[in-house]
Interface confidence: low
C-alpha cells in the first residue's frame, strides 16, 4: 500500500532571465528512493538515480543544473519555459509517486517566488 | 582567459597510487563541470567521469569505477583525479575538460607512465 | 553503452577541397552529437556542439549536420592546418562515448 505523499512548491512564478528551484519532498513513507525523474510535459529535463548519480537531458545542459538535493535548478528562463513540471519518484517497495509543480515566467519584474515550504 | 592546468607527466611504479589534479582559473569554478578523459598512446579517447564542482557530485563510466576516485578542492579551484593499483593499462594521457555534455575547455593532458 | 563507429578511419586531401567524416551511433540520440578536432600532441579542441551548433573561434568551413543515427562532420575547403584526429562524442546517455577517430592528411 502507498503511504506516501509529496509536497511540492506548488504554483510558482519567476522572472525571464531569472533562475528557479523546482522542489518535491516524498514524506510519509518507508519507501527507499531509487530514482527521481524530472519533466515538463512530456520531456525528460533530468535524472537523479541513486547509484548513478545525475543525467541532465542534452537539450537542457546550458540551462539546467542539479541540485539542492533531488530539486533541479532552471537558468536563463524564457516564457517558453512556462508550464507543468513533474518529480516523479521511483520508490521501493511502493512504487511511483507522481507530484505537479506549475511555473510561470513573467516578462516583468512583478515576479512573484511562491514556495509552500523550504527545504533548508 | 579560461583555462584548465595540468602538471606534464607521472611516473609510477605499478600497484601503486597517483593522484593528478587539474587548476582552472578564467571563470567560475563551482558553476561548469569537470571531466576526467584518458587517451593511451596512438588510441582514442575515453570518458572516465565527471564532477559538478557546486555539489561534489560524480558520475563514473563504469569501466573505470574501481579504478578512479574525483575529488575536487574548491577554494584552490581544482579538480583531482586518483587512479588506484596501477598497471601498464594505465599508462596514458589523461585530460581534464569543462562542460556538461560537451566539453569546450581542455587541460593539455598529464602523461602517467606505470614503470617499474 | 552507446558505440559510435567512424569511417573513413584515414582520408588523404588535397588544400581546398571539401571533406566529410562520417560518425554513426548503435542507438538514435537525437542530435546529442560533439566533434573535436586533435592535432599531433595537442589537446582536443571542440568543433561542433549538438549536431550542428557552431562554436565561438571555430572556422566557419566546419560544419555539423545529421540527427537520429548518422552526423557529418564537413570541412568545407581544407587548409594544412586542419591535418589532425577528428573525433565525434555522444552527450545522450552517461558514460559519454567517443567514435574511434578519423585521421585527415593533407598532401
Known amino acids: 500500500m502507498m503511504t506516501g505523499t509529496i509536497e511540492t512548491t506548488g504554483n510558482i512564478s519567476a522572472e525571464k532571465g531569472g533562475s528557479i528551484i523546482l522542489q518535491c519532498h516524498l514524506s510519509s513513507t518507508t519507501a527507499q528512493v531509487t530514482q527521481v525523474n524530472w519533466e515538463q510535459q512530456d520531456q525528460l529535463l533530468a535524472i537523479c538515480n541513486a547509484d548513478l548519480g545525475w543525467h541532465i537531458s542534452p537539450s537542457f545542459k546550458d540551462r539546467v543544473a542539479p541540485g539542492p538535493g533531488l530539486g533541479l535548478t532552471l537558468q536563463s528562463l524564457t516564457v517558453n519555459d512556462t508550464g507543468e513540471y513533474f518529480c516523479i519518484y521511483h520508490t521501493y517497495p511502493d512504487g511511483t509517486y507522481t507530484g505537479r509543480i506549475f511555473l510561470e515566467v513573467l516578462e516583468s519584474s512583478v515576479a512573484e517566488h511562491g514556495a509552500r515550504f523550504q527545504i533548508p | 582567459q579560461v583555462q584548465l592546468q595540468q602538471p606534464g607527466a607521472e611516473l609510477v611504479k605499478p600497484g601503486a597510487s597517483v593522484k593528478m589534479s587539474c587548476k582552472a582559473s578564467?571563470?567560475?569554478?563551482?558553476?561548469?563541470?569537470i571531466n576526467w578523459v584518458k587517451q593511451r598512446p596512438g588510441q582514442g579517447l575515453e570518458w572516465i567521469g565527471d564532477?559538478?564542482?557546486?555539489?561534489?557530485?560524480?558520475n563514473y563510466n563504469g569501466k573505470f569505477k574501481n579504478k578512479a576516485t574525483l575529488t575536487l578542492d574548491t577554494s584552490s579551484s581544482t579538480a583531482y583525479m586518483q587512479l588506484s593499483s596501477l598497471t601498464s593499462e594505465d599508462s596514458a594521457v589523461y585530460y581534464c575538460?569543462?562542460?556538461?555534455?560537451?566539453?569546450?575547455?581542455w587541460g593539455a593532458g598529464t602523461t602517467v607512465t606505470v614503470s617499474s | 553503452d552507446i558505440l559510435l563507429t567512424q569511417s573513413p578511419a584515414i582520408l588523404s586531401v588535397s588544400p581546398g577541397e571539401r571533406v566529410s567524416f562520417s560518425c554513426r551511433a548503435s542507438q538514435s540520440i537525437g542530435t546529442s552529437i560533439q566533434w573535436y578536432q586533435q592535432r599531433t600532441n595537442g589537446s582536443p579542441r571542440l568543433l561542433i556542439k549538438y549536431g550542428s551548433e557552431s562554436i565561438s573561434g571555430i572556422p566557419s568551413r566546419f560544419s555539423g549536420s545529421g540527427s537520429g543515427t548518422d552526423f557529418t562532420l564537413s570541412i568545407n575547403s581544407v587548409e594544412s592546418e586542419d591535418s589532425a584526429d577528428y573525433y565525434c562524442?555522444?552527450?545522450?546517455?552517461?558514460?559519454?562515448?567517443f567514435g574511434g577517430g578519423s585521421k585527415l592528411e593533407i598532401k
Open positions: 562524442q555522444q552527450s545522450y546517455r552517461w558514460p559519454y562515448t
Open positions: 564532477i559538478f564542482p557546486g555539489r561534489g557530485i560524480t
Open positions: 575538460s569543462r562542460g556538461l555534455g560537451y566539453f569546450d575547455v
Open positions: 578564467g571563470y567560475t569554478f563551482t558553476t561548469f563541470w
